[in-house]
């Protein structure tokens, strides 16, 4: 049967009808509505927005829309005792203080409840000491400082520039180096694009602009007080000393005007090379401490933020499937913002809203999807992916048995150059086929497909004539679905032409200047890029929910497994003496990948030939496809990261935003030459190869003929 027959609908209700119903003007209107006041997690304003979205989704025609609430640990500045950083002289007098707030953008001067810049979950404290400049505070930056330059950060306050890696990793690295405080700042080299004006005259970061953000190292735990379980009414909560992922030293963010005042006085060692220099007119000396004339001056932090258990609200909408109501395709994105959320998250939430409206319109005309579609507006994403994770923890048994796919819908844009997609290999062919059917919004590509402009502007490094699709990392709400539960996941947005700055975000990220006007004036005046992202996200959901055979191609997993096995083998072979001494063999892994490739190929042949009119066989084949991602889950999780359970992919241990392949083996090999017990270290490498090989082989066997 065709999908139209399967769901008993008229032929006009196909993908085209759904896509044609999506309108740029509606996305624009929704974005405006969602960005007029702040919607910080845990606040009354964000609760009211949740209720508004619930009401509108019901009006749009969803079968049910419920609020799911949880009481989780959040963090707020003290309203009467502001956070700031000082330079103090030898008498302890404060001779310079950093600003207490960002100058509000035009038109927003009278808005109340704008949270001042702060690092969420910073402990309280007033450390004082000498400053050490640590570049981006990456693992390799601390290696350079400690091993090459012999600079000791113990007892120092470190200052690091934002960018390259997740801020929580910076703080973790600083803690491990013995620092007693961390100052984070935005350097113009990373957050000021040449030839563009500062907001409000352009999309660049002004000197008084500051990036907010959490500094947790949760490793997928969700609410720090209830790891593994939902933060519901009868939850048992850990004490704060046992909470997961909290930083142990004070942390505070500043803008580049204030950073200039701290960095211009720096003495000590010169920067090791040009990669440590930003764009400020300062020497970028590493320190420790200030130069000659100012050597008696110190830096003092004043941090008074508090951690509070606070109620948060997810909105969960359901569109029941006509044929397979017990199979769930989920579209989710967050609603909470640091301030106005002009890009993050409301450019995504507005797109979700329009997708819900389009699906609702079709439903009102008598259509239903084959499978159930769940729509989610997550809360407290900015505080550690808390809303999505708590909901998934509460519903894990349903999700692991019924979850077909999760499509993420945070910011729709981080630029306006080309498409960016990160997803499971199972979705590669879906994304390719869909983008071939969509029109490109790009200038110079009129009448061409999105696939064509995307491939031209962002070509695959491996396969000519194909676009780049990246690995899923973390830092967004797909994390629990993919990394913990093994549900096939994907995300899409429009991005910049700035590959070298991949993880630094756009200049106004998490600042007060992320407004509706930023988007409407500078990024997407016609909302054509938003519309394209709506078509990609919505089109993926439509196909996943409505195609008779799930649009997953297991052969693409075989291709990447081979690539990842080759890569990790090459990394390991950089230690040939130890490989030989400890008899480290990748034979089992290559053999498992070979078996997976052959079995996936045979499965794909059977998928072409089977009788699709037999509902039992159809369901059986679809279940094998649905459960393939699940087969890569190790119930024991990765070493010291129990909620990262996917054996093929995990967030990098050095950058939460980035994905790492064969992470267990990768981490076992990382910096192995510095391990005190090489025999034990190489034993762990061998164990991780064994786990990976077993998992790949076991996953392959789920695709074999069932009997």
């Amino acid at each position: 049967k065709s999908s139209n027959e399967a769901t008993n609908i008229t032929p006009k209700h196909n993908m085209k009808a759904f896509l044609d119903e999506l309108k740029a003007e509606n996305i624009k209107k929704f974005l405006y509505n969602f960005t007029q006041i702040p919607h910080l997690a845990g606040t009354e304003q964000n609760f009211q927005l949740a209720k508004q979205i619930q009401s509108q989704w019901k009006e749009f025609g969803l079968d049910s829309v419920e609020l799911a609430h949880y009481d989780v640990l959040l963090s707020y500045p003290n309203k009467t005792h502001p956070n700031y950083i000082s330079i103090i002289n030898e008498d302890g007098n404060e001779i310079f203080n950093t600003s207490l707030f960002e100058p509000p953008p035009p038109g927003y001067e009278n808005v109340s409840d704008i949270v001042p810049p702060f690092s969420a979950f910073s402990p309280q404290g007033m450390p004082e000491g000498d400053l050490v400049y640590v570049n981006y505070a990456r693992t390799e930056d601390f290696f350079k400082l400690e091993r090459d330059m012999k600079i000791n950060c113990s007892g120092k306050i470190v200052i690091a520039r934002y960018g390259k890696v997740f801020r929580g990793n910076k703080v973790k690295n600083a803690q491990l180096a013995g620092a007693k405080g961390v100052i984070l700042y935005s350097d113009p080299a990373d957050y000021f694009a040449p030839g563009v004006k500062s907001y409000p005259d352009g999309w660049n970061l002004p000197g008084g602009g500051v990036q907010r953000g959490n500094i947790l190292n949760l490793n997928g735990a969700g609410d720090p007080l209830t790891p593994g379980y939902p933060a519901n009414e009868y939850a048992y909560r850990r004490g704060i000393a046992e909470a997961v992922g909290l930083p142990s030293i004070p942390v505070h963010p500043i803008g580049y005007y204030d950073a200039q005042k701290l960095l211009e006085k720096m003495g000590g060692s010169a920067p090791p090379d040009s990669s440590w220099r930003g764009s400020l007119k300062v020497p970028y000396n590493v320190g420790p401490g200030f130069t000659g004339n100012f050597s008696t001056q110190k830096v003092k932090m004043h941090i008074h933020s508090t951690n509070e258990v606070t109620r948060i609200y997810n909105v969960i909408g359901t569109l029941r499937g006509a044929v397979e109501p017990d199979r769930y395709v989920i579209l989710g994105g967050h609603r909470d913002s640091w301030v106005f959320g002009g890009i993050d998250p409301q450019s995504g939430a507005a797109v979700v809203h329009e997708i819900v409206r389009s699906f609702g319109t079709l439903k009102k005309e008598g259509w239903r999807p084959r499978r159930t579609i769940l729509f989610a507006s997550w809360d407290a994403e900015e505080f550690g992916l808390l809303g999505s994770t708590e909901w998934a923890e509460e519903n894990s048994r349903l999700l692991q048995e019924r979850g077909v796919a999760y499509i993420n819908a945070d910011s729709s844009i981080e630029g306006n150059y080309t498409l960016r997609v990160d997803c499971t290999p199972l979705m590669y062919s879906l994304v390719h086929n869909l983008t071939k059917e969509l029109k490109s919004p790009d200038e110079g590509f009129e009448g061409k497909s999105l696939y064509e402009s995307w491939t031209k502007k962002s070509p695959s490094p491996e396969f000519s004539g194909m676009p780049r699709i990246s690995k899923l990392g973390s830092g967004n709400d797909f994390e629990v679905f993919f990394q913990r539960l093994g549900i096939a996941s994907g995300r899409a947005r429009y991005t910049k032409n700035w590959e070298t700055n991949k993880f630094s975000g756009y200049p106004l990220y998490h600042s007060v200047y992320e407004t509706y006007e930023l988007v409407e004036k500078f990024y997407d005046p016609m909302f054509k890029y938003h519309l394209t992202v709506a078509q990609v996200r919505g089109g993926m959901v439509f196909e996943l929910a409505n195609s008779i055979v799930l649009p997953f191609d297991c052969r693409d997993y075989a291709v990447v497994l081979r690539k990842y096995a080759d890569k990790i083998y090459s990394i390991s072979m950089k230690h040939p003496q130890e490989m030989k001494t400890y008899s480290v063999s990748f034979d089992s892994l290559f053999s498992a990948v070979k078996n997976f490739t052959e079995i996936a190929s045979k499965f794909s042949e059977r998928l072409q030939d089977f009788d699709k009119s037999n509902p039992i066989v159809l369901r059986m084949m679809n279940d094998q496809l649905m459960f393939l991602e699940r087969a890569f889950i190790d119930p024991l999780g990765l070493p010291d990261r129990p909620f990262y359970r996917h054996v093929i992919y995990a967030p990098s241990s050095h950058n939460k935003y980035a994905g790492e392949s064969f992470p267990g083996i990768y981490d076992a090999l990382f910096d192995i030459e510095s391990k005190v017990d090489p025999s034990k270290a190489w034993g762990e490498v061998k164990r991780q190869i064994y786990v990976a090989a077993f998992t790949v082989q076991a996953a392959a066997e789920t695709l074999s003929e069932v009997a």
């Epitope: 491996e462 081979r562 690539k563 096995a565 080759d566 890569k567 083998y569 090459s570 390991s572 072979m573 040939p576 490989m579 030989k580 008899s583 480290v584 063999s585 990748f586 034979d587 290559f590 053999s591 990948v593 070979k594």
Partner: nanobody, 113 residues
Framework: EVQLLESGGGLVQPGGSLRLSCAAS????????LSWVRQAPGKGLEWVSS????????DYADVVKGRFTISRDNSKNTLYLQMNSLRVEDTAVYYC??????WGQGTLVTVSS
């Protein structure tokens, strides 16, 4: 039984070139990544280069990058290492390695004037 047989070594002047070959048998050649590893006289083993299933995925040690090229011919079950702009410090026994535990017997490359 896995067998790896290197050939192509010899004496060459600095700046010269050599092409090493490694004929493989006893396993599904195209299913494995392969490497070249070398051992200079009196020194430890040093990784030189690795290659994935096809010639698109290659990796080189910094000291040989831009001078050496690894390649494979899956139809001939053979791995190659093209070595250009050879230096005295490239003098070593070069080994072909499969999966980390299967090594060839090596071929000696001597770079000397």
């Amino acid at each position: 039984e896995v067998q790896l047989l290197e050939s192509g070594g010899g004496l060459v002047q600095p700046g010269g070139s050599l092409r090493l070959s490694c004929a493989a048998s006893g396993f599904s050649f195209s299913s494995y990544a392969l490497s070249w590893v070398r051992q200079a006289p009196g020194k430890g083993l040093e990784w030189v280069s690795s290659i994935g299933e096809n010639n698109a995925t290659t990796d080189y040690a910094d000291v040989v990058k831009g001078r050496f090229t690894i390649s494979r011919d899956n139809s001939k079950n053979t791995l190659y290492l093209q070595m250009n702009s050879l230096r005295v410090e490239d003098t070593a026994v070069y080994y072909c390695v499969k999966d980390g535990v299967h090594w060839g017997q090596g071929t000696l490359v001597t770079v000397s004037s």
